[in-house]
Interface confidence: medium
Amino acid sequence: DFGLDCDEHSTESRCCRYPLTVDFEAFGWDWIIAPKRYKANYCSGECEFVFLQKYPHTHLVHQANPRGSAGPCCTPTKMSPINMLYFNGKEQIIYGKIPAMVVDRCGCS
Amino acid sequence: DFGLDCDEHSTESRCCRYPLTVDFEAFGWDWIIAPKRYKANYCSGECEFVFLQKYPHTHLVHQANPRGSAGPCCTPTKMSPINMLYFNGKEQIIYGKIPAMVVDRCGCS
């Protein structure tokens, strides 16, 4: 399992992971105490047939070619959590591991 | 976590799971001894903002709106394995659980 890593200078058109810092302060999300920003990353690019396909299923659907099935799209295939300190709806301070906040790898599925 | 289920008569345009039987025999994939066919399902449909989003990350990327980030796409969010009997490259018969062969749920990511 592998995926491409790119940056803003890359000429890669295929599915790739790009750096992205999410800034909660800039969004005005004041209920998030910490972190105020974090490296989230994102996926972008084209999914040519078979390139970076995560699942055999993707290939099989392409073979079967059912009505309305779009080609695979560039999407996170591995994600990781971050620890966050935030206010919940009852204004209690919560410290917890929030799943799937960081994209570690992108692929076509 | 939930996802929509549709069939060929559905008028649903949003991201949905559709039935699909993959027939290895029809593909001529005779190195697969069994099963000869199985219910794989597939995902299709539109991902309006926030509808069926699997990860908070998807929402955050939409907020940050980086260069080249496409909107979320309709993709498997839960998959399950099937047991398969097949020949490997050395013509040995292998029996094993092959991951991510069946789409159990679709969502936008």
Partner: antibody
């Protein structure tokens, strides 16, 4: 429907070879194991071996390994069983049988179709 | 090789009777046992697979049971067409081996 049609009866002399054919129809021949089973007159059934037509991979009963060869011709959907160095105790009806996979385990099979049998008589 | 011992080797019964045939393996065969019916001059016909599963189209008067090394075939109410020879087969490992057969005759 699945049909297995075998070649006609043969009379052979001791030491000779015999090649029995089994023509399959009604299914995708290459994707199913074909087995060979024999039955001496008034006796029980004896498994000889199998072959997977897609790639020719075969398993033989050790008892016959030195004398038997199983082959297939995918262009005609035909399986063959050749037995060499025939002896009088090889006189038997030889059956081909398709093995169907029904389940989820590594040995989940049964014989769902049989040929009509080919009588091979070995006599001097 | 796994030895399959079938008993009895022959059995006389009347129409309407319930009969049981047993098959004993020389080692655990993990329920990978099939039963066949054979009539004179004909190819065998599959009845039961995986010890207790009925092949499509086979009447429910045939049933199989057992596990480990001991297995049975039961015919609940004999009809004239059921008089034949019955064989068990183990498919847990190669070589596949059959029992020696049980000839079911009309009393």
């Amino acid at each position: 429907q699945v049909q297995l049609v075998q070649s006609g009866a043969e009379v052979k002399k001791p030491g000779a070879s015999v090649k029995v054919s089994c023509k399959a129809s009604g299914y995708s021949f290459t994707g199913y194991f074909m087995h060979w089973v024999r039955q001496a007159p008034g006796q029980g059934l004896e498994w000889m071996g199998n072959i997977y037509p897609y790639n020719g991979v075969s398993n033989y009963n050790q008892r016959f390994k030195a004398r038997v060869t199983m082959t297939t011709d995918t262009s005609t959907s035909t399986a063959y069983m050749e037995l060499r160095s025939l002896r009088s105790d090889d006189t038997a009806v030889y059956y081909c049988a398709r093995r169907y996979y029904y389940g989820t385990g590594p040995a989940d099979w049964y014989f769902d179709s049989w040929g009509q049998g080919t009588l091979v008589t070995v006599s001097s | 090789d796994i030895q399959m011992t079938q008993s009895p080797s022959s059995l006389s019964a009347s129409v309407g009777d319930r009969v049981t045939i047993t098959c004993k393996a020389s080692q655990d065969i993990n329920s990978y046992l099939s039963w066949f019916q054979q009539k004179p001059g004909k190819a065998p016909k599959s009845l039961i697979y995986r010890a207790n599963r009925l092949v499509d189209g086979v009447p429910s008067k045939f049933s199989g049971s057992g596990s480990g090394t001991d297995y049975t075939l039961t015919i609940s109410s004999l009809q004239p067409e059921d008089f034949a020879t019955y064989y068990c087969l183990q498919s847990d490992e190669f070589p596949l081996t059959f029992g020696q057969g049980t000839k079911l005759e009309i009393k």
